[in-house]
């Protein structure tokens, strides 16, 4: 606001000030007089650009008039007091009401004094992020979803995510008119090494204390990717017993392990327990490949292992090392 | 036609009281400021005070608080003041004078041809 | 009270530029003084003609305009005529009242 004057009397009231569709507003407007100055106000006068006459008039003797007296109201402005504060009240948003208003005073002997305000209408937007759930495609497709509904202005969207990718933002008018719907996606290939990872929305509007942040775990749909694990190449005869592990990683989960060797059927010293293959001790060399075959949802893979099984070194008390 | 028809010459003694009229016409008296004047013989303007008509509001120049009382009928769009206690310094010619609004300042718009007031025992 | 002060009298001739001035006791004019310019004729006939410091009241030719030079308000008769002999006055505002100056005697010569 202007500071104070020193001699001349002043109009003061704020550039700008933001309102919410649908709400009610007040537009401050006051009259500062330097403490030795008289002046009288015989008449204070709302009326918006580019509008010819007034939308709202109090005179010093007939009191207030209206273009629209169920939506403004002077808030301070009384028959038979100074008049100092010009302050108008606004009812019921609309998007229409948004623009440039001037406040004046018609004083006495200074002569009219006026400032010009800018109402905002602004909307709230409501925010919702949720996954876009995806299978390994190839090619770009969107992974995540964020949307800010009916915000006026429109809101900002922004992204954050250590996997790369890039946002897809596109507009669409709101459900109450003047507001619009910010949609954004999040574009990347995908891959195994996204399932389960985060990505964050970030939407920035006007009518927010500070940016909300909507947090979105990612879902790739993807077949198992086997490997086996558990043999380090050094099993021996006459060692304790072993154990092969199926690992898999798969979205959705594995719905079943199937263990087997090239050959065939397991031979009787192997044992499957699911993912888990038991190999019992064993009295003569051995040199098997075994398969682990996992399925789920979206098809099987599998994974091979060749385990071959020395006779050790006496000097070596050490058995079949087990996982 | 915009008019500030003032009351005709007085003459009074020193002590008493005179009042003055300004019957306005043509124009919005309620919502009108009015100022009167003072001038002497040969001499520049003095300003008395102001009123305005709608309220009967009223700014009065210190020099004449106490001396000049000014009022308003708007039921006649008429303008008083009052002078007491005259004394022979308060001869001089009195207008009444309707202001004007340019927009961003007043201007003294509508002048009455004045009246003489002649204080003399 | 404050003094405001005129030149008490100013010639001139037809078509040339003339300017009144007005100085304040207190110091320097400003736009808060809302300076006043009034014509007075002969008979009493007198006439507003500035408002505010600058503000031309409705009907008053173009040649009349307000202004504050230096210090001072002042007005200023671009292209005087015969019909502009007369005295001036100005007024000022002092937060409360007007005062008014002495007048300064026009006289356009023809």
């Known amino acids: 606001w202007p500071p104070p004057g020193t001699g001349d009397i002043i109009v003061q009231a704020p550039t700008q000030v933001p309102g919410f569709l649908g709400d009610s507003v007040t537009l401050p407007c006051y009259l500062q007089v330097p403490g030795m100055e008289e002046t009288h106000v015989s008449q204070l006068t709302w009326s918006r650009h580019g509008e010819s006459g007034s939308m709202a008039v109090f005179h010093q003797t007939q009191g207030p008039n209206y273009s629209e007296p169920k939506r403004l109201e002077f808030v301070a402005a009384r028959l038979g007091t100074e008049l100092r504060d010009a302050s108008l009240r606004m009812f019921g948003l609309r998007v229409e009401d948004e623009g440039n208003y001037t406040c004046l005073f018609v004083t006495f002997p200074q002569g009219s004094r006026s400032v010009d305000i800018w109402l905002r209408v602004l909307a709230k937007p409501q925010n919702t992020a949720e996954v876009q759930k995806v299978q390994l495609t190839g090619k770009p497709v969107p992974v995540a979803r964020c949307v800010s509904t009916g915000g006026r202005p429109p809101a900002h969207i922004t992204w954050h995510s250590d996997l790369g990718g890039m946002p897809n933002t596109s507009q669409a008018p709101g459900f109450l008119s003047g507001t619009v719907t910010v949609t954004s996606l999040w574009i990347l290939v995908p891959s195994s090494q996204v399932d389960g990872k985060s990505v964050t929305c970030k939407v920035e509007h006007e009518s927010f204390e500070k940016p909300q942040l909507l947090t979105v775990n990612l879902t790739v749909y993807y077949p198992p990717e086997v490997s086996i694990s558990g043999y380090d190449n050094n099993w021996y005869l006459s060692q304790n017993e072993a154990t092969l592990t199926c690992d898999a990683r798969s979205n959705p989960e594995p719905t079943g392990y199937n263990w087997s060797t090239t050959m065939g059927p397991l031979p009787p010293f192997a044992v499957a327990q699911g993912a888990q293959l038991l190999i019992r001790p064993v009295d003569k060399p051995i040199n098997t490949t075994f398969i682990c075959n996992v399925t789920n949802a979206l098809g099987a893979r599998q994974a091979e292992l060749t385990v071959q099984v020395k006779e050790g070194p006496p000097s070596e008390p050490s058995g079949m090392s087990s996982n | 036609q915009v008019q500030m028809q003032q009351s005709g010459a007085e003459l009074v003694k020193p002590g008493a009281s005179v009042k003055l009229s300004c019957k306005t016409s043509?124009?919005?008296?309620?919502?009108?400021?009015i100022s009167w004047l003072k001038q002497k013989p040969g001499q520049s303007l003095e300003w008395i005070a102001w009123i305005y008509a709608g309220t009967g509001d009223t700014n009065y120049n210190q020099k004449f608080t106490g001396k000049a009382q000014v009022t308003v009928d708007t039921s006649s769009s008429t303008a008083y003041m009052q002078f007491s206690s005259l004394t022979t310094e308060d001869s001089a010619i009195y207008y009444c004078?309707?202001?004007?609004?340019?927009?961003?300042?007043?201007?003294?718009?509508?002048w009455g041809a004045g009246t003489t007031v002649t204080v003399s025992s | 009270q404050a003094v405001v002060t005129q030149e008490s009298a100013l010639t001139t001739s037809p078509g040339e530029t003339v300017t009144l001035t007005c100085r304040s006791s207190?110091?320097?004019?400003?736009?808060?003084?809302?300076a006043n310019w009034v014509q007075e004729k002969p008979d009493h006939l007198f006439t507003g003609l500035i408002g505010g410091t600058n503000n031309r009241a409705p009907g008053v030719p173009a040649r009349f305009s307000g202004s504050l030079i230096g210090d001072k308000a002042a007005l200023t008769i671009t292209g005087a005529q015969t019909e502009d002999e007369a005295i001036y006055f100005c007024?000022?505002?002092?937060?409360?009242?007007?005062?008014f100056g002495g007048g300064t005697k026009l006289t356009v010569l023809g």
């Open positions: 207190t110091g320097a004019v400003t736009t808060s003084n809302y």
């Open positions: 043509g124009f919005t008296f309620s919502s009108s400021y």
């Open positions: 004078v309707r202001h004007g609004s340019t927009g961003r300042g007043w201007y003294f718009a509508v």
């Open positions: 007024a000022l505002w002092y937060s409360n009242h007007f005062v």
